[in-house]
């Protein structure tokens, strides 16, 4: 099924060569004697059989219906029929954009990370033998490249590479010149790979508390989707019934990273909770980052410099 037209809904631009190739072509060669027919229906017209006399712009081959070129009135449904095999297409021919070298409906967008490999290759396998020359345009300005048969860009992407790249193939058929345009919208973005996760705020935090009261220690981090954030405290986590890890909260940042926070709730604070390390760690494939909290009795606040306190 080499280069057959498999998608049932096709939009093309007026004035360009175009073809429909059915997807049982190899089968058609095997049964040369079988009757093969192409039909068109549009609006009030029902199943009109196509033949070379239908229009000087239409050419019929074994597997292919060619338009030289396709025009607005070619819009409609097309059928290929051979024995009990039928293939149907819905063709929509749209107006060419007179103010640009391409039509926006016919754009393929690609997003490329800066410094990553980026390529544009101007190829058209079906019309290859008929193509005289091919030009590559960036934002409708012609690029001067060495190869005028298959112009190619292969490089590591830079932000300046962003833009609309149009491959224009020029070809002759029956003494007339035609062109076919293929346009790529290339957007260059910052490296989307993983960040080194980081815990927000000071690495050591003294928290002033009162015995018998409750406290919530909030640990926040900027991390990747697969990174984890957890609390470590005491000899064995979970040995103190008054200490609870709350459910982790995550919000996605506009850059696609995550802002996560995990609260450690200590209820009915006792002497055993004072002056011990409550460690919060963020772990990723790239390493870990830890910050510590120490509970200090409010009465002892005067002994510690003010800048190390967290409320």
């Amino acid at each position: 099924a080499e280069s057959c037209t498999s998608r049932p809904h096709i939009t093309v631009v007026e004035g360009e060569p175009f073809y429909l190739k059915h997807c049982s072509c190899s089968l058609a060669h095997e049964i040369e004697t079988t009757t093969k027919s192409w039909y068109k229906s549009s609006g009030s017209q029902e199943h009109v059989e196509l033949n070379p006399r239908s229009s000087s712009r239409i050419a019929l081959h074994d597997c292919v219906l060619e338009f030289w070129p396709v025009e607005l009135n070619d819009t409609g449904s097309y059928f290929f029929q051979m024995k009990n095999y039928t293939q149907k297409w819905k063709l929509n021919v749209i107006r060419r954009n007179k103010h640009s070298c391409f039509t926006e409906r016919q754009v393929t967008s690609k997003i490329v990370e800066v410094k990553k490999f980026f390529q544009i290759t101007c190829e058209n396998s079906y019309y290859q033998t008929l193509v005289n020359s091919t030009s590559l345009y960036k934002n409708c300005k012609k690029l001067l490249l060495e190869n005028n048969k298959n112009p190619t860009i292969k490089k590591n992407a830079e932000f300046e590479d962003q833009g609309y790249y149009s491959c224009v193939h020029f070809l002759h058929h029956n003494g007339k010149l035609f062109n076919i345009t293929k346009t790529f919208n290339i957007t260059i973005v910052e490296d989307r790979s993983n960040i080194v996760p980081v815990l927000l705020g000071p690495k050591l935090n003294h928290v002033a508390v009162e015995l018998g009261k409750n406290v919530r220690l909030n640990c926040s981090a900027l991390l990747n989707e697969e990174d984890v954030i957890y609390w470590m405290f005491g000899e064995e986590n979970g040995s103190d019934p008054n200490i609870h890890e709350e459910k982790e909260m995550r919000i996605m940042t506009p850059e696609g990273k995550w802002h996560a926070s995990k609260v450690l709730r200590i209820e009915n604070i006792g002497e055993s909770n004072l002056n011990v390390l409550y460690n919060c760690t963020v772990a990723s494939t790239g390493g870990t980052d830890t910050k510590s909290f120490i509970l200090v009795r409010k009465a002892d606040m005067a002994d510690i410099p003010g800048h190390v306190f967290t409320r």
Epitope: A1, S6, R7, C23, R105, V107, S109, Q119, N185
Partner: antibody
């Protein structure tokens, strides 16, 4: 006619990787983009990323960046999706599906039958 | 990233009634007269099925009781007269830009 046939169900342990294949037939493999969409039990559809088989261009949803790899073998018209560092919430049905390459044509008219991936210790 | 929000989450109707499902995009998905919004139907244990492409075009083989409308950020899928087989989950999807995205779905259930 156009068909996508996916590999069979997989059961994996957390931290492991899974590679799902999708064999295309009935059309020119390099002319359509291949996408991967997953659906966790009782949840909605989640687009994971895409590959253009003509030049191996890939684009992944940010959520899967760094964990997913999409590849293709044009000689056998097959696309692959590998997801690494599996977690229990990766348990889902994974679908391959095709679209045209123009932005306007990136809708999914042909789907694979789905591959169930279960992540459990 | 374009976020699609579908409403309602669940719609309870009877066969024969008219269903109106909504999909709102966080930014416009329309350009040069085309709207890059598509609709799917999914039944339990099955892959999704394309219903409408480019906001209003009916996919081949889909009954004409299904129709799509809208432009810019607001889109609607309408089922004119519900048949028993129409009760399923419906998703909208945009292709205006990468990453592609789906709405969270609307469950259409029998009242």
């Amino acid at each position: 006619q156009v068909q996508l046939v996916q590999s069979g169900a997989e059961v994996k342990k957390p931290g492991a990787s899974v590679k799902v294949s999708c064999k295309a037939s009935g059309y020119t493999f390099t002319s359509n983009w291949m996408h991967w969409v997953r659906q966790a039990p009782g949840q909605g559809l989640e687009w994971m990323g895409t590959i253009d088989p003509s030049d191996s261009y890939t684009y992944y949803a940010q959520k899967f960046q760094g964990r997913v790899t999409m590849t293709r073998d044009t000689s056998i018209s097959t696309a692959y999706m590998e997801l690494s560092r599996l977690r229990s919430d990766d348990t889902a049905v994974y679908y391959c599906t095709t679209s045209g390459d123009y932005d306007a044509d990136r809708y999914f008219d042909v789907w694979g039958q789905g591959t169930t991936v279960t992540v459990s210790s | 990233e374009i976020v699609l929000t579908q409403s309602p989450g669940t719609l309870s109707l009877s066969p024969g009634e008219r269903a109106t499902l909504s999909c709102r995009a966080s930014k416009s998905v329309s350009t040069s007269g085309d709207s890059y919004m598509h609709w799917y139907q999914q039944k339990p244990g099955q892959a999704p099925r394309l219903l409408i492409y480019l906001a209003s075009n009916l996919e081949t083989g889909i009954p004409d009781r299904f129709s799509g409308s809208g432009s810019g950020t607001d889109f609607t899928l309408t089922i004119s007269r519900l048949e028993p087989e129409d009760f399923a989950v419906y998703y909208c999807q945009q292709s205006r830009e990468l990453p592609l995205s789906f709405g969270q779905g609307t469950k259409l259930e029998i009242k």
